[in-house]
């Protein structure tokens, strides 16, 4: 079998809502991944995992279940929704993304993304991580690749 | 408005220990982690930790591991720096300071800790 | 730990001139930097936050930038409250270090 080839694009847009009372953030990010299959033969994206981390923190995680098939050669556009939530100890961070005298208050995230595929019985997990400014501020929408994301050698320490 | 006030100076004798304290107030105490750091005359700065009064979660550098304990009575809004085993080097100014997303936003006045026999 | 590398050490200026100063961090820091004065004798004064964002009564003659692992400060028109001496920070992952300071001194 050739390689199934998973590359995630970035966000594509983040959602916000704050509680006041509760001090605490609301974040739906939208996230992109191409996956591309290599074979002559059709796969199975079975499901896609994902989770986001703040502060090496976890805030959010999702799960997408019997997603799609791509066939042979062919690749498709994925986007998934992951809800994320920032407060309690990190609740401090509310002072930030409300803070009315800055214009963008972006936010470092890490993005962590599985994808398992079938075919034939065999099953693949594939996963990627990055890092990703957000904007915690405001309602976004980004251009593909347009927040920047980087690879990650080494999580944090 | 936010402040962070320290104990005054300290003068003590090598071998000693100290206990400093770093009194918060306008604010909500528990929302923000409060750090700690050295500073030897006319030098930079170094961080020695930080505790999280929400969850009481404390961070220390390594090199400050055995020298430096920090602890908290939320009663008071108080946050303290305890040094042991005190040496010369020992001596410096150490500030309190609140963490804030990308930046230490206020800072105590500062303790002075001279270690003399 | 990440090192963070401050220059010039020191600086010797005319009030009225404009100043940069930069800070390396030895690995990328995603903007998890502040920039702090300190007069002789005082605490440390937050200018800028998350590399780019201004503190509360700051004037803004002050500005922050940059990314990755390269950062700076510039400050326009120097005014004679602005001599002392400045300080990096990186607030990525523990333990936060400082860069060496620049000690800015009237000319």
């Known amino acids: 079998p050739r390689s199934i080839d998973v590359k995630y694009i970035g966000v594509k847009s983040a959602y916000v809502s704050y509680d006041v009372q509760k001090r605490t953030i609301y974040l739906n990010i939208t996230n992109t991944l191409n996956i591309t299959n290599n074979n002559y033969y059709s796969v199975e994206v079975e499901n896609i995992t994902a989770q986001v981390q703040f502060a090496k923190t976890v805030i959010g995680k999702a799960r997408l279940n019997n997603i799609t098939h791509i066939g042979p050669l062919d690749m498709k556009q994925i986007d998934y929704t992951v809800p994320t939530v920032i407060a309690e100890e990190m609740s401090y961070m509310y002072d930030f993304c409300t803070l009315i005298s800055i214009k963008v208050h972006n936010i470092v995230l890490m993005m962590q993304v599985t994808v398992t595929t079938t075919y034939f019985g065999h099953s693949e997990q594939i996963s990627q991580e990055r890092y990703q400014y957000v904007d915690c501020g405001r309602n976004t929408t980004y251009q593909l690749g347009q927040s920047e994301y980087l690879n990650v050698l080494q999580p944090q320490q | 408005q936010v402040q962070l006030q320290q104990s005054g100076a300290e003068l003590v004798k090598p071998g000693a220990s100290v206990k400093m304290s770093c009194k918060a107030s306008?604010?909500?105490?528990?929302?923000?982690?409060i750090e700690w750091m050295k500073q030897n005359h006319g030098k930079s700065l170094e961080w020695i930790g930080n505790?999280?009064?929400?969850?009481?979660?404390?961070k220390y550098n390594e090199k400050f591991k055995g020298k430096a304990t920090l602890t908290v009575e939320k009663s008071s809004s108080t946050v303290y720096l305890e040094l042991s085993r005190l040496t010369s080097d020992d001596s410096a100014v150490y500030y309190c300071?609140?963490?804030?997303?990308?930046?230490?936003?206020?800072w105590g006045q500062g303790t002075s800790v001279t270690v003399s026999s | 730990d990440i090192q963070m590398t401050q220059s010039p050490a020191s600086l010797s200026v005319s009030v009225g001139e404009t100043v940069t100063i930069t800070c390396r961090a030895s690995?990328?820091?995603?903007?998890?930097l502040g920039w702090y004065h300190q007069k002789q004798g005082k605490s440390p004064q937050l200018l800028v936050f998350?590399?780019?964002n201004l503190a509360d009564g700051v004037p803004s003659r002050f500005s922050g930038s940059g990314s990755g692992t390269q950062y700076s400060l510039k400050i326009n028109s120097l005014q004679s409250e602005d001599f002392g001496t400045y300080y990096c920070?990186?607030?990525?992952?523990?333990?936060?270090?400082f860069g060496g300071g620049t000690k800015l001194e009237i000319k």
């Open positions: 306008g604010y909500t105490f528990t929302t923000f982690p």
């Open positions: 300071a609140r963490y804030f997303y990308g930046g230490m936003d206020y």
């Open positions: 920070q990186h607030l990525w992952s523990v333990p936060w270090t």
């Open positions: 690995e990328n820091i995603y903007s998890s």
């Open positions: 505790f999280h009064p929400y969850n009481d979660d404390t």
């Open positions: 998350a590399a780019t």
